[in-house]
């Protein structure tokens, strides 16, 4: 969380951003809030990116003002217009690209003053893993698959029964480049699986951490998966 204070003739206003990550090819949100004003006409929101000449987005007098917008963001940005009046300046970024990563500034002017805060935006790919029993294998085998990751993650297996055990000798992980030549499909196989145990396949890079759990008993199979972004720091 980054909190910025502005300096003005009246008083500075507090602007708060939250560092976040974008999943390439999908839509992302750059989060920014500010002390609300009571009238829309006096609110100006400017999003800027370090190293980019034009603006990322500008909203003023109740409308998008995109004449100064940089080419790389053309047609890809929007504010939540109905939420501006309650202090939400967050930016929706469509079709996130790897090159969207960097330092952004959320700059706010209201009738009460000015303020700004920076935001670190990381980009990559992350997806939920699915763990299944591989019935084609000769021994009891689990297969963990996640369709899109970038940068290349690490994969670690764990088990509830053998806590702290190292499964690197009995697992095999491969990374297959997807058709767009950036993201990769992650496949990890765990051998010599015992019944009545819960296994976890943990995939992690510097952007996200995802876990796929599977519990195999003689009567049923239970699955659960979870994904967590690693860098949600407020500013």
């Amino acid at each position: 969380l980054i909190i910025g204070f502005g300096i003005s003739g009246r008083h500075s206003i507090t602007v708060t951003t939250v560092a976040s990550a974008g999943n390439i090819g999908e839509d992302g949100i750059l989060s920014c809030t500010f002390e609300p004003d009571i009238k829309l006409s006096d609110i100006v929101i400017q999003w800027l990116k370090e190293g980019v000449l034009g603006l990322v987005h500008e909203f003023k007098e109740g409308k998008d003002e995109l004449s100064e917008q940089d080419e790389m963001f053309r047609g890809r940005t929007a504010v939540f217009a109905d939420q501006v009046i309650v202090g939400n300046a967050s930016l929706r970024l469509k079709n996130v690209q790897l090159t969207d990563a960097g330092t952004y500034k959320c700059y706010i002017i209201t009738s009460k003053g000015k303020g700004n805060a920076n935001l670190e935006y990381k980009t990559g790919a992350f997806s939920m893993p699915e763990v299944n029993v591989d019935y084609n294998a000769s021994s009891e085998t689990l297969r963990c698959e996640a369709p899109r990751w970038f940068p290349q993650p690490t994969v670690v297996w764990a088990s509830q029964v053998d806590q702290g055990a190292n499964f690197s000798e009995v697992s095999n992980t491969s990374f297959e480049l997807n058709s767009e030549n950036v993201t990769m499909k992650v496949v990890s196989v765990l051998y010599n699986v015992t019944i009545n145990n819960t296994y976890s396949c943990m995939i992690e890079n510097d952007i996200a951490k995802a876990t796929g759990d599977i519990k195999v008993t003689e009567s049923e199979i239970k699955r659960r998966s979870h994904l967590q972004l690693l860098n949600s720091k407020a500013s």
Epitope: H11, E35, P36, I38, K39, L40, S41, E61, G62, K63, A81, D82, Q83, I85, V86, G87, K112
Partner: antibody, heavy 117, light 107 residues
């Protein structure tokens, strides 16, 4: 859940003052504007003023400057509006209303102020 | 001061009919218009914010449209509980102002 509870009805003589309270609960009182709105009998709605309890910033409708004074006490999450030099045309229901997720999304039940000699 | 003019002042309709309420601003207010419903003895209730966003819990027979100076609240099929007074309000500039109201009454 968000609630705004206003003080009870008041009957005042011309020239007197009255202070209406609005106790807020269910949200962060200091983070949102609190407004006051007047509705005279059989009439429409009229915005009086607003206060941002986080820093006591106020905005007044010019028409009510000198008539209304608004304050907020953050320790009790209560907003106040004092009306001075009361006249018969100040007879009205006064509402407090806040803007949490949308404009005027929560309202108090209203306080009837009657000015009569 | 931005003046909001609502029309008609009174709308006499039967349950099941469509109601179209108009609100015209004296200057451009972008999308900064909200609509409220008020019944006798009650506080106003938010229906539509920012011209077209239906507030939580408001039935989908209520819809708002418009931007700039012309705004419309539409009730697609009137229910008995919809007979009330409706106000538009702008938050584009101060002083914040309300329209004079439209009373929707049973024909």
């Amino acid at each position: 859940q968000v609630q705004l509870v206003q003080s009870g009805a008041e009957v005042k003589k011309p020239g007197a003052s009255v202070k209406v309270s609005c106790k807020a609960s269910g949200y962060t009182f200091t983070s949102y504007w609190m407004h006051w709105v007047k509705q005279a009998p059989g009439q429409g709605l009229e915005w009086i003023a607003a206060i941002y309890p986080g820093n006591s910033d106020t905005d007044y409708n010019q028409k009510f400057k000198g008539k209304a004074k608004i304050t907020a006490v953050t320790s009790t999450s209560t907003a106040y509006m004092e009306l001075s030099s009361l006249r018969s045309e100040d007879t009205a229901v006064y509402y407090c209303t806040t803007t949490v997720a949308h404009y005027f999304d929560y309202w108090g039940q209203g306080t009837m102020v009657t000015v009569s000699s | 001061e931005i003046v909001l003019t609502q029309s008609p002042a009174t709308l006499s309709l039967s349950p099941g009919e469509r109601a179209t309420l108009s609100c015209k601003a004296s200057q451009d207010v972008s999308f900064a218009v909200a609509w409220y419903q008020q019944k006798p003895g009650q506080a106003p209730r938010l229906l539509i914010s920012s011209a077209s966003y239906r507030y939580t819990g408001v039935p989908d027979r209520f819809s708002g449209s418009g931007s700039g100076t012309d705004f419309t609240l539409t009730i697609s099929s009137l229910e008995p509980e919809d007979f009330a007074v409706y106000y538009c309000q702008q938050h584009y500039n101060t002083p914040l102002t309300f329209g004079g109201g439209t009373k929707v009454e049973i024909k």
